[in-house]
Interface confidence: low
C-alpha cells in the first residue's frame, strides 16, 4: 500500500476555493522528489495539472498551486475559482504519476443554493450552538413573533412567543424578545443535528405588514483533520468542543464499517480492550478540552476517530464531535523493538527503549501504565535520576545504547511488577512506545547473597554466580545509586557448584571492598552485557555495622540466602496527572530519592581471584 | 471540607477477620492514593497499606503483607482494608488517610487528611 495519504473526498461550492493537504514520510528522497497533482482521465492516465517543479497546466493558471513542506512530510495543492468542470477523480504522489508513490482524492464541486435576496447564511458544526437574528419594524414589536423552516413549498412553524415549539427542536430552542427600544429579536438553537440544515424565516407580525428575513442554517459535519503518524509510534488526538459541554463525559470513537462509532475511550471508564496498554485520556482542562494518546500504532489502528461529548459517553446526534482521519506509515523511522519482555520472579528485565535520535540530549523517561478510569503512566525512573522510592535498588535509565536507543533494568522482579510501561522523553512526543512485562516461570540465572552484613574497615568479598550460557558475556559489578549504576572492578573467578549441570563451565563473578567504610551501605548490581547491550541483572543490599570481627568476610554462596530480606519502602507510585506525560519536565520539582552516598572508590573495590572451593568453609 | 469517616472495627478472636470501610466526602476521591495506618496504645502511628489513584498500585506493611487486602471503589468515594488471620499484635485504632500525591505512599508525611480512627481488637 502506498505510503502517501491525503483526504479520500473534497467538496465545496462553485465560485470557492479548496486546499488539499497530502503527506509522505519525509525520507531524505522523498523531501527532494517531484509532487504533482494530476486529473485521471477515461483512459486510466494521469494528466499533470500542477508539480512542484514548477508546471500549472493551462485550465489551472493563474487559479492553482503546490507548496511542498518538506520538513513536515506535507504538500499542499490550492485551487481557486472552482467550477463544476473541476468535478472529478485525481491524485497526489510523489516520482512519476504512473508509479505507486500516489493517493485517490476525489472533488466534488456543486452548484451553490439560490437564496432569496438579503438572506442571512449561518454555517455551523454540528452539535454547536447557532443564535439566528431576526429584525423588525416598531409597529409589529407587540405582535407575534415566529421562525419557520422552509420543507419545499411549506413553510413549519419551529417556535413562536406564544410558547410553541416543534417537537424536532424540543429542549434546545429558545426565542428571545429584547427589552424595549431593541427592533430584533433572536432564536438560539443548540445542539445542532444534520437534519437541521435548510432555509427559515423569521416573522414577525401578520398580514402585509409583516417583517421577514430568510436564514440559511447550513450543518456541516467537521472536516476531519487528518493525521499521519509512523507504525509503533504514538498519536495525539486533542479534543476542545467548548465550555458547554465542559462537565459533560467525554469520548472517543472509532468509525466502523456501519458508519457506527465504537467506544475507544470514555470518561466514564469504558475502553477497548484492543487499546489496553498504549492509550490515555488526558484530563480535561477547565474549557472542557482534553486529549486522548495512542501508542504502539499497528496498521490497524488506522481510520476514522470522533471525539465527543454526552452523558452516556458515546455519540449521539447533535452533541459537538470533532473528527480525525489517521494515517499508520508502515515506512516507519521508529525501530522495531519487543513489544513483550518476560521475566521470572526474582529476576530482571533489560528493557530497549527507542527515542527519536535526533534528540539524544532530551530527558528520557519510563511510567507504569495505570489502566483503571482513563488510564495514567506515573513516572517511575527519569534519566536525571529521579527513582520512585519503591524501586530504589532494582531500576535504572541508562543512556546506552544511544543513537535512538536507550535501556531500562528492572531487577527483583515479582508478579506485581506485570503490566505496561512506557518509554518516552520530553521531545518528539510521537517516539512514545509500550513494552508489557510479563512474569513467566522459572529461576533467575544470576545467584547473588540475599543480604549482607559488613563491618566497618575490614574486606567484603560478594559473589555472583552466573550459568554457562553467559561465559562469552561480559561480567560487571555497579554500586547503584538515583543516578544510575557506577561500575565497580571485579573479577572472573574459578567453576563454581552453583550450576550442577555445567559445573565446569560455570562461573563467578565476585565484587571486594576493601577497607569496607560508611559510604559502601547500599544497593550492588550483578550483571552481564555484551557491547552496550545488557542482559540479566542481580541486586544485593549491603549494610555497613560498627561490630568489629577478626578477620576477612565472605560472603559465602552456599549460605547466602536466596533473595534480600525485603523492607518496606517509604514510597509510592508518584500519582500525577497525565498532563505530564506531554510535558515531563512537571515533574522537575517532585521529589527524589536521595543518592546512597559516595560510590565505592575504585582503589578500595579490589579483585579476589581465588576460586569458590577455596574459600567455601568461610563463614558467612 | 475533606471528611473521612472509618467504620468496621471491633472485638475478634485470633484468625478471625474483619472489614473496614472509609467513607470520603469532599474531595476528587478518584484522584488520590489512600492509605490505612495504626496505632497501638504507646505506639507511634505506622503504616499498614495503601492503594493507588487508580487502584492499580498497592503497598503493604511486612507484618499484614498476605493477610490484609486494600482495595477502593472509585464511584462510592469508598477505600475497604480486608484483614484475615488477626493476630493480637494487630490490636489498634485503625486511621483512614487521604495522600498528598507526592509520590510516598508508606510514610505518615505522605497524607494530609485522616480520620478519626475505628478500633481493632484481637483477643487471644
Known amino acids: 500500500k502506498s505510503p502517501v495519504f491525503g483526504p479520500q473526498e473534497v467538496s465545496s461550492v462553485e465560485g470557492n476555493s479548496v486546499s488539499i493537504k497530502c503527506y509522505y514520510p519525509p525520507t531524505s528522497v522523498n523531501r527532494h522528489t517531484r509532487k504533482y497533482w494530476c486529473r485521471k482521465g477515461a483512459s486510466g492516465r494521469c494528466i499533470t495539472l500542477v508539480s512542484s517543479e514548477g508546471y500549472v497546466s493551462s485550465n489551472y493558471a493563474g487559479r492553482a498551486n503546490l507548496t511542498n513542506f518538506p520538513e513536515n512530510g506535507t504538500f499542499v495543492v490550492n485551487i481557486a475559482q472552482l467550477s463544476r468542470d473541476d468535478s472529478g477523480h485525481y491524485k497526489c504522489g510523489l516520482g512519476i504519476n504512473s508509479r505507486g508513490l500516489s493517493f485517490d482524492v476525489s472533488l466534488e464541486v456543486s452548484q451553490g443554493p439560490e437564496l432569496p435576496n438579503g438572506t442571512e447564511v449561518y454555517t455551523v458544526d454540528v452539535g454547536r450552538t447557532v443564535t439566528i437574528k431576526c429584525p423588525f419594524k416598531t409597529e409589529n414589536a407587540p405582535k407575534t413573533k415566529a421562525l419557520y423552516k422552509k420543507i419545499g413549498q411549506t413553510s413549519v412553524l419551529v417556535i413562536d412567543s406564544r410558547n410553541y415549539v416543534n417537537p424536532n427542536y424540543k429542549d434546545r430552542i429558545r426565542l428571545r424578545i429584547p427589552g424595549t427600544g431593541q427592533l430584533i429579536f433572536t432564536v438560539v438553537i443548540d445542539r445542532l443535528r444534520l437534519s437541521d440544515h435548510g432555509l427559515y424565516l423569521c416573522q414577525a407580525g401578520d398580514g402585509s405588514n409583516r417583517d421577514e428575513k430568510n436564514a440559511d442554517l447550513q450543518v456541516l459535519e467537521p472536516e476531519p483533520e487528518l493525521v499521519y503518524e509512523d507504525l509503533r509510534g504514538s498519536v495525539t488526538f486533542h479534543c476542545a468542543l467548548g465550555l458547554e459541554v465542559a462537565n459533560v463525559a467525554k469520548f472517543l470513537c472509532r468509525v466502523n464499517s456501519r458508519e457506527t462509532c465504537d467506544v475507544v475511550i470514555n470518561t466514564l471508564g469504558k475502553r477497548d480492550s484492543a487499546f489496553e496498554g498504549r492509550i490515555l485520556l488526558n484530563p480535561q482542562d477547565k474549557d472542557g478540552s482534553f486529549s486522548v494518546v495512542i501508542t504502539g500504532l499497528r496498521k490497524e489502528d488506522e481510520g476514522r476517530y470522533l471525539c465527543g461529548a454526552h452523558s452516556d459517553g458515546q455519540l449521539q446526534e447533535g452533541w459537538p464531535i470533532q473528527a480525525w482521519q489517521l494515517f499508520v506509515n508502515e515506512e516507519s523511522t521508529i525501530p522495531r523493538s519487543p513489544t513483550v519482555v518476560k521475566g521470572v520472579a526474582g529476576g530482571s528485565v533489560a528493557v530497549l527503549c527507542p527515542y527519536n535520535p535526533k534528540e539524544s540530549q532530551s530527558l528520557k523517561y519510563w511510567c507504569l501504565w495505570e489502566g483503571a478510569q482513563n488510564g495514567r503512566c506515573p513516572l517511575l525512573v527519569e534519566s536525571q535520576g529521579l527513582v520512585q522510592e519503591q524501586y530504589e535498588g532494582r531500576l535504572s535509565l541508562l543512556q546506552e545504547p544511544g543513537n535512538g536507543t536507550f535501556t531500562v533494568i528492572l531487577n527483583q522482579l515479582t508478579t506485581q511488577d506485570a503490566g505496561f510501561y512506557w518509554c518516552l522523553t520530553n521531545g518528539d512526543t510521537r517516539w512514545r512506545t509500550t513494552v508489557e512485562i510479563k512474569i513467566i516461570e522459572g529461576e533467575p540465572n544470576l545467584k547473588v547473597p540475599g543480604n549482607v552484613t559488613a563491618v566497618l574497615g575490614e574486606t567484603l568479598n560478594i559473589p555472583c554466580h552466573f550459568p554457562c550460557k553467559f561465559s562469552s558475556y561480559e561480567k560487571y559489578w555497579c554500586k547503584w545509586s538515583n543516578t544510575g549504576c557506577q561500575t565497580l572492578p571485579s573479577q572472573d573467578e574459578g567453576p563454581s557448584e552453583a550450576f550442577v549441570n555445567c559445573d565446569e563451565n560455570s562461573r563467578l563473578v565476585s565484587l571486594t571492598l576493601n577497607p569496607v567504610t560508611r559510604a559502601d551501605e547500599g544497593w550492588y548490581w550483578c550483571g552481564v552485557k555484551q557491547g552496550h547491550f545488557y542482559g540479566e541483572t542481580a541486586a544485593v543490599y549491603v549494610a555497613v555495622e560498627e561490630k568489629k570481627v577478626a578477620g576477612s568476610r565472605y560472603v559465602s554462596p552456599a549460605k547466602a540466602d536466596a533473595a534480600p530480606d525485603e523492607k518496606v519502602l517509604d514510597s509510592g507510585v508518584r500519582e500525577i496527572e497525565n498532563k505530564a506525560i506531554q510535558d515531563p519536565r512537571l515533574f522537575a520539582e517532585e521529589k527524589v530519592v536521595a543518592d546512597t552516598g559516595d560510590q565505592a572508590g575504585g582503589s578500595r573495590a579490589s579483585v579476589d581471584s581465588s576460586s569458590s572451593e577455596e574459600q567455601g568453609g568461610s563463614s558467612k | 471540607q475533606v471528611q473521612l469517616v472509618e467504620s468496621g472495627g471491633g472485638l475478634v478472636q485470633t484468625g478471625g477477620s474483619l472489614r473496614l470501610s472509609c467513607a470520603a466526602s469532599g474531595l476528587t476521591f478518584s484522584s488520590y492514593t489512600m492509605g490505612w495506618f495504626r496505632q497501638a496504645p504507646g505506639k507511634e502511628r505506622e503504616f499498614v497499606a495503601a492503594?493507588?489513584?487508580?487502584?492499580?498500585?498497592?503497598w503493604y506493611a511486612d507484618s499484614v503483607k498476605g493477610r490484609f487486602t486494600i482495595s477502593r471503589d472509585n464511584a462510592k468515594t469508598m477505600v475497604y482494608l480486608q484483614m484475615n488471620g488477626l493476630k493480637p499484635e494487630d490490636t489498634a485504632v485503625y486511621y483512614c488517610?487521604?495522600?498528598?500525591?507526592?509520590?510516598?505512599?508508606?510514610?505518615?508525611?505522605?497524607?494530609?487528611?485522616w480520620g478519626q480512627g475505628t478500633l481493632v481488637t484481637v483477643s487471644s
Open positions: 488517610a487521604k495522600g498528598r500525591n507526592n509520590g510516598y505512599a508508606t510514610a505518615v508525611r505522605a497524607y494530609d487528611y
Open positions: 492503594i493507588s489513584w487508580g487502584g492499580a498500585s498497592t
